[in-house]
Each structure stands twice: as structure tokens, then as C-alpha cells.
């Protein structure tokens, strides 16, 4: 049994990361292996992760950890039984994946603007609870071309369209996602999306 | 919200027994080390013991080494401290503190031992 | 043992005037990427002592923005920027090298 594709990490910078890897060959990841992991402080001992399947050679491990700072260092060892496979480490604050927004709503009762609003991933008390920014992919469920995307760099969670701006009387869904610039991180997942019918009222042409 | 609780101190004869105790809630208390630490009236603070979180390690100070007896039980969430023969110079209030990133994140109210003829 | 020698041992301070406490160890506390194994603990008259910074410069979860700590080395500082009625105490410097944990005698911070 040997490692094909090492582990990676990343962190949401609060309570959890998620490692993955291949193996290079079917592997059954909950019983054969497992991935011990250890704060480099004192006094800190190694926990256990057991892996869950990805794909028939692929696995991926839940590791449970505080909040982060940018002083912790994790030592990664995986297990085959007595065997290790392999060694490494990782900085949870280098390797950022932020939570995905929640909560999206789309408010369609402001005259003829749209008000989409979702909710910060983070508690206040969490470092990138101030420093997120969010790109909103809005799209119609008819038009396939008719994708776009809103870069929403300001901090407050919304961001108000024109009704106009898109077509009128017909559905489209929209969806969020969010990253932080001061740690580098990698976009967040998209939030799941919503859907509503969008109609406004045609200006009156004058001729 | 993480609370200790420590219990067990009192008055105590030289060369007498105690055992303290420290009860946890609000955070997972296996994944975490825990420590003793103890301040005599009027004087500073002084680290004892520490047990990691399984229970497998455990550390003392020198002084300690032999008289006292750290340990845990993590079906409980109590760690708990025997203290052996004791001495006049032992009397304190004994604190419980949770570990991270190797100080004491959060700490308990603290327990009194006084020993005294 | 690594011994912690805080000082000075009483410090009358002013509100709103800063304050500054020095802790210095018998060996050095710092690693290869920047960080210090050093804590600083408040103890308030009559209460447990709580946590104001750890590994030498990160502030503790509800710490006020006023208290600050740096250094390097076997020196280090807690600085209060402006002080207020409610930051007397004993004030503890603590290492997190190695074991035994050792902290420094403490600084008592009054009002004058």
C-alpha cells in the first residue's frame, strides 16, 4: 500500500480542516488507514482523523482544531496499521479555504432593484469575519450565456442590482462565494442557490 | 462557554491526604492537556502538575514528584489531584487550567488547602 | 528550569497614561519563525488569573486592544497603552518552552 498523491490541506480558519489524498489503489480509507495529527506546542498530543472514502483511490480526513492562528503548526502522520506511510506538516493560516456564505435571499419587493443579502460564515470574533469580500454569481435557469458575475468588495454582506439589468419574466438563481485577501486564501464553495422570477415594470416610451 | 470547577480542598494535618477535583464543561475536555497550579496567601504563582489529554503523559513540577499525583477521566470530565503528605508550606489555593498552545487558555476559581495542626 | 525575572516589582501608574512591564528569561524563548513562548497573565484582587497574551504577541480572546505584548529573545514587555481603573493586578509573565512552566514574581499595578 503506498501514497500516490500526497496529502493536502486546507483550513476554514476556525474549526476545521480537510486533507485529502490518493492512494494507488482501491483503498477501504475508514479501516486501513488513519492520519494523526499534532499541534507543535507543549504539551499537545496527536489526535486521530479516520478517513472517509473520495473516489475509489481517494481519501479525505475531517480534522478537528481550535481557532486558528498564524503560529500553529500541525504534524501530519498516516497510518497503514503499524506502517507509516507518510509524514508531513501543515500551517492551517497558509492554507485558507473560507466557510461559504449562507442564508442568500434575494429581496424582490424594493421598486425595481434587487437586494440580495446572505449571511457572514464567521462569528465576529474570528479573524476573517471583517476581512471576507464575495463574488455573487447570478445566472438565468433559460439562457445559459446569460451568466454573470457581481464582485462585492466592500464588507457588508449584500449587494443591490437594478431589476433592469436582467430580463424580464423569466427565472434565474442565484448563488455566493467568498475569500479573503489577507491570507491568500483559495474562493470558498458557492452557497447553495435561490431562485426567483424577476418582472418589473417596462419604462414608458415616449415618441 | 468553558467553566472549571475545582472542589475537594479544606483543612488538612501535616503529613495528612486530599484529593482535589475539577470538573469541566464547554469544550471537548479529552482533546485538551489540563493543569494544576497553585498560589500560597500573598505569593505567586507556581505550576504543579499537567496531564495530556488522553492521560497517557503526565508532568510535574520537581517539588511535586512523588507527593502528588495528577490524573483524569475523561468519561467524567474531571482531572483530579492527590496530594500525599503533606506540609504547612503546601497550603494554597490549587487552581485547575485548561492547556493551549502551552499556557493556560482558561482557568477555574480555585480551591483552598490549608494545612495545619 | 528556565527562571522568569519580572520588573519592577510594584508599578504606580495614572489613567489614561501608559504603562510598561519587562520580563526576562534565563534562556531564550524564541524559534526559528518568529514566535516567542511566552504568556501574560492578569491577576484581578480576589479572582483567578486570566489570559492576556500568549505566544509573546497575540492578544487573548476579549483582551482589550490597549494591552500589547512584545520582544524577543530573553526580553520581553507588556505594554498597557492607556490604563484604566479596571487593569489593576498582579501581572504574570509565564514560559511555554518546556516544562516545569515557570513564571515570573509578578507586578502589581496600582493606581496612584
Known amino acids: 500500500m503506498k501514497v500516490l498523491q500526497e496529502p493536502t490541506c486546507v483550513s476554514d480558519y476556525m474549526s476545521i480542516s480537510t486533507c485529502e489524498w490518493k492512494m494507488n489503489g482501491p483503498t477501504n480509507c475508514s479501516t486501513e488507514l488513519r492520519l494523526l495529527y499534532q499541534l507543535v506546542f507543549l504539551l499537545s498530543e496527536a489526535h486521530t482523523c479516520i478517513p472517509e472514502n473520495n473516489g475509489g483511490a481517494g481519501c479525505v480526513c475531517h480534522l478537528l482544531m481550535d481557532d486558528v492562528v498564524s503560529a500553529d503548526n500541525y504534524t501530519l502522520d498516516l497510518w497503514a496499521g503499524q506502517q507509516l506511510l507518510w509524514k508531513g506538516s501543515f500551517k492551517p493560516s497558509e492554507h485558507v479555504k473560507p466557510r461559504a456564505p449562507g442564508n442568500l435571499t434575494v429581496h424582490t419587493n424594493v421598486s425595481d432593484t434587487l437586494l440580495l443579502t446572505w449571511s457572514n460564515p464567521y462569528p465576529p470574533d474570528n479573524y476573517l469575519y471583517n476581512h471576507l469580500t464575495y463574488a455573487v454569481n447570478i445566472w438565468s435557469e433559460n439562457d445559459p450565456a446569460d451568466f454573470r458575475i457581481y464582485n462585492v468588495t466592500y464588507l457588508e454582506p449584500s449587494l443591490r442590482i437594478a431589476a433592469s439589468t436582467l430580463k424580464s419574466g423569466i427565472s434565474y438563481r442565484a448563488r455566493v462565494r467568498a475569500w479573503a485577501q489577507c491570507y491568500n486564501t483559495t474562493w470558498s464553495e458557492w452557497s447553495p442557490s435561490t431562485k426567483w422570477h424577476n418582472s418589473y415594470r417596462e419604462p414608458f416610451e415616449q415618441h | 462557554e468553558v467553566q472549571l470547577v475545582e472542589s475537594g480542598g479544606g483543612l488538612v494535618q501535616p503529613g495528612g491526604s486530599l484529593r482535589l477535583s475539577c470538573a469541566a464543561s464547554g469544550f471537548t475536555f479529552s482533546r485538551y492537556a489540563v493543569s494544576w497550579v497553585r498560589q500560597a496567601p500573598g505569593k505567586g504563582l507556581e505550576w504543579v502538575s499537567a496531564i495530556g489529554g488522553s492521560g497517557g503523559k503526565t508532568y510535574y513540577a520537581d517539588s511535586f514528584k512523588g507527593r502528588f499525583t495528577i490524573s483524569r477521566d475523561n468519561s467524567k470530565n474531571t482531572l483530579y489531584l492527590q496530594l500525599n503528605s503533606l506540609r504547612a508550606e503546601d497550603t494554597a489555593v490549587y487552581y485547575c487550567?485548561?492547556?493551549?498552545?502551552?499556557?493556560?487558555?482558561?482557568w477555574g476559581q480555585g480551591t483552598l488547602v490549608t494545612v495545619s495542626s | 528550569d528556565i527562571v522568569m525575572t519580572q520588573s519592577p516589582l510594584s508599578l504606580p501608574v495614572t489613567p489614561g497614561e501608559p504603562a510598561s512591564i519587562s520580563c526576562k528569561s534565563s534562556?531564550?524563548?524564541?524559534?526559528?519563525?518568529?514566535?516567542?513562548?511566552l504568556d501574560w497573565y492578569l491577576q484581578k484582587p480576589g479572582q483567578s488569573p486570566q489570559l492576556l497574551i500568549y505566544l509573546g504577541s497575540f492578544t487573548a480572546k476579549g483582551v482589550p486592544d490597549r494591552f500589547s505584548g512584545s520582544g524577543s529573545g530573553t526580553d520581553f514587555t507588556l505594554k498597557i497603552s492607556r490604563v484604566e481603573a479596571e487593569d489593576v493586578g498582579i501581572y504574570y509573565c509565564?514560559?511555554?518552552?518546556?516544562?516545569?512552566?515557570?513564571f515570573g514574581g509578578g507586578t502589581k499595578v496600582e493606581i496612584k
Open positions: 487550567a485548561r492547556n493551549l498552545r502551552g499556557g493556560f487558555w482558561d
Open positions: 509565564m514560559q511555554t518552552l518546556q516544562t516545569p512552566l515557570t
Open positions: 534562556q531564550s524563548l524564541s524559534e526559528g519563525q518568529g514566535y516567542h513562548r
